[in-house]
Amino acid sequence: GSERTCCPVNWVEHERSCYWFSRSGKAWADADNYCRLEDAHLVVVTSWEEQKFVQRHIGPVNTWMGLHDQNGPWKWVDGTDYETGFKNWRPEQPDDWYGHGLGGGEDCAHFTDDGRWNDDVCQRPYRWVCETELDKASQEPPLL
């Protein structure tokens, strides 16, 4: 299989996951493809602790995460349940704003300058974060 036991070069390990932080911008779909082609996915935030970790690395810069509602309901790219999971939206968000004049609403979620989340036009070229989980099996204690 493609399970990892340690993080690739230039990735950061944290709590049994590996993270890669871009320094350029892409539309959400291209960022999604980039991560998938690294055998990873756009970052899925499952706790306040993980939120703080990512926020500390990206700084005050708009950055895509693996959350979108392009097909209706909000969904995490790895299948993590949105409704029962961690959320950190800015007040009044998500609002699916149509006033930007670019056509359609706002279907992709990103970290804003203060770390809280906003929905925005998926074509905007924001930075992004890839995440991949380390081999679950390697966490098991050895058999005696």
Epitope: S2, K26, A29, D30, N33, Y34, R36, L37, E38, D39, P125
Partner: antibody, heavy 121, light 106 residues
Framework: EVQLLESGGGLVQPGGSLRLSCAAS????????MSWVRQAPGKGLEWVSV????????YYADSVKGRFTISRDNSKNTLYLQMNSLRAEDTAVYYC??????????????WGQGTTVTVSS | SYELTQPPSVSVSPGQTASIACSGD??????ASWYQQKPGQSPVLVIY???KRPSGIPERFSGSNSGNTATLTISGIQAMDEADYYC?????????FGGGTKLTVL
């Protein structure tokens, strides 16, 4: 020396199947995305498929989606292309190629010599 | 589907400079690569990430990309540069090639 060597091409009837292989050497195979690219006689290059280094993500051209399957065996340093329901328009030289980095940003920096697939009755 | 358009042919005299254009919607927002293919041979990457040269590619080969057009420039053209040239980019989960340009050295 970095090298890619394709095999498995040949003559097949329409509707038939063929499996192409690409043996890689001289680099850490599992670290790189790989692609198949084809070229019909007298025509330009046409991308067929790409697979991530670990094999978890695959993408296909619309013209082959549902008929072709790309896969890899990193323990054998080998890339595969399973071709089913072959059509006359699939006739081409098929190249195996290594991506220099992530395919969204980089080009293919190593190419095999190609293997010829002919679909005809 | 996304398309990359190249001129079918370009002719240039030895020692001159050849420019091959590749156009596509907002191509400047993507990374362009260029390949050289001589008759009966496999393609060779000559430019990636718009303007970078792999090791072994002469400095005579350069690239740029902005707006809707990526350009491959070959200065001091030599007979050995006669070949087909293809541009390539990634768009919407697919790899896209231009139709190719036949460069003829007069």
């Amino acid at each position: 020396e970095v090298q890619l060597l394709e095999s498995g091409g040949g003559l097949v009837q329409p509707g038939g199947s063929l499996r192409l292989s690409c043996a890689a050497s001289g680099f850490t195979f599992s670290s790189y995305a790989m692609s198949w690219v084809r070229q019909a006689p007298g025509k330009g290059l046409e991308w067929v498929s790409v697979i991530s280094g670990g094999g978890s993500s695959t993408y296909y051209a619309d013209s082959v989606k549902g008929r072709f399957t790309i896969s890899r065996d990193n323990s054998k340093n080998t890339l595969y292309l399973q071709m089913n329901s072959l059509r006359a328009e699939d006739t081409a030289v098929y190249y195996c190629a290594k991506w220099r980095g992530n395919p969204t940003d980089y080009g293919m920096d190593v190419w095999g010599q190609g293997t010829t697939v002919t679909v005809s009755s | 589907s996304y398309e990359l358009t190249q001129p079918p042919s370009v002719s240039v005299s030895p020692g001159q400079t050849a420019s091959i254009a590749c156009s596509g919607d907002n191509l400047g927002d993507k990374y362009a690569s260029w390949y050289q293919q001589k008759p009966g041979q496999s393609p060779v990457l000559v430019i990636y990430q718009d303007s970078k040269r792999p090791s072994g590619i002469p400095e005579r080969f350069s690239g740029s990309n902005s707006g809707n057009t990526a350009t491959l420039t070959i200065s001091g053209i030599q007979a050995m540069d006669e070949a087909d040239y293809y541009c390539q980019a990634w768009d919407s989960s697919t790899v896209v090639f231009g139709g190719g340009t036949k460069l003829t050295v007069l």
